[in-house]
């Protein structure tokens, strides 16, 4: 029983340290983000940025991501499309 408790304690400590290291690693990776808005049904991110989300005008909730850098709002007669664009900054 003592051995089991010791193993559990060690495992817990490993988890704590690992979790802390992962958190620090994630924290040190900065995300640079910007928003792009276009008239019509497409909005494109600059080079090096990836689409992380899209928004559509005319209360349209149907969209997809094209060629990795472009938001496409799928409703007819779209008046505007927005893209949230992010890239990792070490």
């Amino acid at each position: 029983k003592t051995l089991c408790s010791m193993e559990e304690a060690i495992n817990e400590r490993i988890q704590e340290v690992a979790g802390s290291l992962i958190f620090r690693a994630i924290s040190s990776i900065g995300l640079e983000c910007q928003s792009v808005t276009s008239r019509g049904d497409l909005a494109t991110c600059p080079r090096g940025f990836a689409v992380t989300g899209c928004t559509c005008g005319s209360a349209c909730g149907s969209w997809d991501v094209r060629a990795e850098t472009t938001c496409h709002c799928q409703c007819a007669g779209m008046d505007w499309t927005g893209a949230r664009c992010c890239r990792v900054q070490p």
Partner: antibody
Framework: EVQLVQSGAEVKKPGESLRISCKGS????????INWVRQVPGKGLEWMGM????????KYSPSFQGHVTISTDKSVSTAYLQWRSLQASDSAIYYC??????????WGKGTLVTVSS | QSVLTQPASVSGSPGQSITISCTGT?????????VSWYQQHPGKAPKLMIY???KRPSGVSNRFSGSKSGNTASLTISGLQAEDEADYYC??????????FGGGTKLTVL
């Protein structure tokens, strides 16, 4: 190495149909738009339209909408530009170009189309 | 769809600097900082020289630079060399997610 290999020169008569091709290699074909650009010899460049090879969603310049059709076959990494009824004014060099974000980064060598009776 | 306005021709002597302008509207050049510039030698396909207004692709000489003010973008070539003689085209993404080109500028190196 990114390459866009275009089909050879064509000589056609007015009213005939035509499809020219552009095969992409050296990159993931479905991750980039393919654009078509027209150049009448001795004149400037005109953007015709672009297509997403993933599902062939196309966007056209108002100047070319309805006169040409842009399509792709992603299984063979190839894009196409097609006319149902050619006119003499379609005589030009046609470039296929990879679109990366806001710019056109890799160009094919062009296909010369001559339409003459 | 109207093209962007470029001078038909410019010229300069080796070693000099030249600037080519590209004027559009608030719906294209002025609406985005996403003007690109292309060089085309006779009988060849165009080549991307500047993207996103002022950035150079790898392999393009730092003698080429781009800028923008309002609805006008500019390409500057410094230390002009014989091999720079070519046609230059500006292009802008538009607020309708289409692209438009300038009419082209013929650069002559005297």
């Amino acid at each position: 190495e990114v390459q866009l290999v275009q089909s050879g020169a064509e000589v056609k008569k007015p009213g005939e149909s035509l499809r020219i091709s552009c095969k992409g290699s050296g990159y993931t074909f479905t991750n980039y738009w393919i654009n078509w650009v027209r150049q009448v010899p001795g004149k400037g460049l005109e953007w015709m339209g672009m297509i997403d090879p993933t599902d062939s969603y196309a966007k056209y310049s108002p100047s070319f909408q309805g006169h040409v059709t842009i399509s792709t076959d992603k299984s063979v990494s190839t894009a196409y530009l097609q006319w149902r009824s050619l006119q003499a004014s379609d005589s030009a060099i046609y470039y296929c170009v990879r679109g990366y974000s806001y710019d056109l980064d890799y160009w094919g060598k062009g296909t010369l189309v001559t339409v003459s009776s | 769809q109207s093209v962007l306005t470029q001078p038909a021709s410019v010229s300069g002597s080796p070693g000099q600097s030249i600037t080519i302008s590209c004027t559009g509207t608030s719906s294209d050049v002025g609406g985005y900082n996403y003007v690109s510039w292309y060089q085309q030698h006779p009988g060849k396909a165009p080549k991307l020289m500047i993207y996103e207004g002022s950035k150079r692709p790898s392999g393009v000489s730092n003698r080429f630079s781009g800028s923008k003010s309002g609805n006008t973008a500019s390409l500057t070539i410094s230390g002009l060399q014989a091999e720079d003689e070519a046609d230059y085209y500006c292009s802008s993404y538009t607020t309708r997610s289409t692209r438009v080109f300038g009419g082209g500028t013929k650069l002559t190196v005297l």
